[in-house]
Structures are given as structure tokens and as C-alpha cells.
């Protein structure tokens, strides 16, 4: 399956937090969205292979890596002024 | 930052086997990435042997899937190739490489390089 | 496997001279993600080759805005835009979209 943690996460004013998405289905791409209060998903960036990934529409304030398949942990920056927000990971063939 | 050190011997003689080590620092070879090794001939032309992911699996070069084998010491850091069967024509640099974050397979952490003069 | 060829093979130019260095592909190097796995190397003598550009045309961490990469599908070029004394190196194109990944036979900048 795919796993993403922590289901609750506090950031102290200027820091950087990190969210962990992990998945053991073999799928080569993985996807972070952020869905606001009343508004529909919005991609921040996006992976298809190991070592590459792209920006999505909202990419501002925001890191990823892919360092293996499995994993592809989002990095919310100082950067994000407004990071308050339901966060998804997905993945796919 | 990733460094990368070649070590092995400079001199294999022909039929034999090519051994050299690369010593990672900076970065565990087994939290990601592809460590590849790739040589250059003495008329200056790269080739691209083959790799060993994070995870212990191989992609080789098919020229020399045969004679290649890449494997990895994860206590030292470290992984190693073996090329069998050498002639003249393995003469070269021989560089370790891992790719650069978010650059696809882009390689751009290399070794020193090391020369292997293949000769009796 | 995948043929690169690069061309010219070498070339005489002039410090602020604009210079394009070409890459063919035998195939396309569009990958099934869309991607295409295209790089760029400057190789200087007695040392390893630097990374400039990839994927086409995304210049690398501290590679000068004077480098700039382009094309699509088989066809590739390095440009140059005003060369600098420190420029003046052989060149490779790249490809991992098809392992085994493979490099062009290098193109040779010279000082005129």
C-alpha cells in the first residue's frame, strides 16, 4: 500500500517540516496534492522515475526528492507563507 | 556533498580480472540512487558500464554483460567492479559516478578516476 | 543501443564568439514519462567531466547563464553565447532514456 505521516503535523513560525509518503506497490510515478478548505486537489510536484521530478501549479514553497521508488517525502518550506492545508501523496504505474 | 574515491590496481594483465573499489563519503549507498561506473578510453571516448542501485540491484551494459559484475560492501560504503577476461582494448579511465539530485540519471558526482593499463 | 553523434568533432572559435555544438540521436530519446533524458558534459584535461545541462535544457547548479541547451526528440544542440577563455574544453552529449545509456564521441573547442 502507500503510507503517508504524520496524519497531524504543527509548524513553528519559519521552520521547515517534512511529510514522508511511502509505498511498496512497485509504481515508478508519486504525486503530493494540497487540498484547501472547499477547493479541489492541487498538484505541487510530481515524480515519474527515481532522481526526477517536476513542479506542479503550486510548487512555491515546496521541496521534494526521490531518492528511491519507494519514497517521496514533501519538504514544506519557511518559504510557504500559508502551508495550513490537507496535504495527499499518491502513487501510480 | 557525495565524494567519490577509485582505488584498485593500475596495471591488470591480459586474461585477467580487473578489480577496482569506489569508497562513498557524504551519503549512505544505500538511502538511494544508482552508483555507476563508467570508463574512458584512450582516445577520449566514455562508456557507460553499469550501475548498482540502492537497493543491490544491477544494470548493465549488454557489450559487457558477460564480464561485468558490479556488487557493494554497505558496512564500508563502498562498491566495487570486477571486469573478467581483460584485453588491451580494457585500457582506460575507469570512474565511479552517482547522479545529481532531480537530474534524472544525469551523473555529475564523480571520482578522481583511475587508469588501468591492461598488459603483460 | 543508441548512437550519439556529435558535430563538428572539433572547432577553432574566439573568445565572445557564439558557438553551437550539435547531438543526433539513432532514435528518440523521448522516454514513456515524457521526459527526455538529454545531457550536456564539459570535460577539461586530466579531469572528470561536469554536468552543464539536463534533460535538454536545464542548466546545472552554478553552469554560467552564457550555456543554454535545445531540441527535441533526435535532434540537440549546446550553444555558447559568448565564449569565455575557461570554455575552451571537449564537449559530450548524453543519454539515459535507453540503458545502456550512451555518450556522443565528444566535440573538441579550440582556441582560434
Known amino acids: 500500500g502507500i503510507t503517508q505521516s504524520p496524519k497531524y503535523l504543527f509548524r513553528k513560525e519559519g521552520q521547515n517540516v517534512t511529510l514522508s509518503c511511502e509505498q511498496n506497490l512497485n509504481h515508478d510515478a508519486m504525486y503530493w496534492y494540497r487540498q484547501d478548505p472547499g477547493q479541489g486537489l492541487r498538484l505541487i510536484y510530481y515524480s515519474q522515475i527515481v532522481n526526477d521530478f517536476q513542479k506542479g501549479d503550486i510548487a512555491e514553497g515546496y521541496s521534494v526528492s526521490r531518492e528511491k521508488k519507494e519514497s517521496f517525502p514533501l519538504t514544506v518550506t519557511s518559504a510557504q507563507k500559508n502551508p495550513t492545508a490537507f496535504y495527499l501523496c499518491a502513487s501510480s504505474i | 556533498q557525495v565524494q567519490l574515491q577509485e582505488s584498485g590496481p593500475g596495471l591488470v594483465k591480459p586474461s585477467e580480472t580487473l578489480s577496482l573499489t569506489c569508497t562513498v563519503s557524504?551519503?549512505?549507498?544505500?538511502?538511494?540512487?544508482?552508483w555507476n561506473w563508467i570508463r574512458q578510453f584512450p582516445g577520449k571516448g566514455l562508456e557507460w558500464m553499469g550501475y548498482?542501485?540502492?537497493?543491490?540491484?544491477?544494470n548493465y551494459n549488454p557489450s559487457l554483460k558477460s564480464r561485468i559484475t558490479i556488487s557493494r560492501d554497505t558496512s564500508k560504503n563502498q562498491f566495487s567492479l570486477k571486469l573478467s577476461s581483460v584485453t588491451a582494448a580494457d585500457t582506460a579511465v575507469y570512474y565511479c559516478?552517482?547522479?545529481?539530485?532531480?537530474?534524472?540519471?544525469?551523473?555529475?558526482?564523480w571520482g578522481c578516476g583511475t587508469t588501468v593499463t591492461v598488459s603483460s | 543501443d543508441i548512437q550519439m553523434t556529435q558535430s563538428p568533432s572539433s572547432l577553432s572559435a574566439s573568445v565572445g564568439d557564439r558557438v553551437t555544438i550539435t547531438c543526433r540521436s539513432s532514435?528518440?530519446?523521448?522516454?514513456?514519462?515524457?521526459?527526455?533524458?538529454l545531457h550536456w558534459y564539459q570535460q577539461k584535461p586530466g579531469c572528470a567531466p561536469k554536468l552543464l545541462i539536463y534533460k535538454v535544457s536545464n542548466r546545472f547548479s552554478g553552469v554560467p547563464s552564457r550555456f543554454s541547451g535545445s531540441g527535441s526528440g533526435t535532434d540537440f544542440t549546446l550553444t555558447i553565447s559568448s565564449l569565455q577563455p575557461e570554455d575552451f574544453a571537449t564537449y559530450y552529449c548524453?543519454?539515459?532514456?535507453?540503458?545502456?545509456?550512451?555518450f556522443g564521441q565528444g566535440t573538441k573547442l579550440e582556441i582560434k
Open positions: 557524504g551519503y549512505s549507498i544505500t538511502s538511494g540512487y544508482f
Open positions: 548524453s543519454q539515459s532514456t535507453h540503458v545502456p545509456f550512451t
Open positions: 559516478a552517482s547522479p545529481s539530485p532531480g537530474t534524472g540519471y544525469a551523473v555529475d558526482y
Open positions: 548498482i542501485s540502492y537497493d543491490g540491484s544491477n
Open positions: 532514435q528518440s530519446l523521448v522516454h514513456s514519462n515524457r521526459n527526455t533524458y
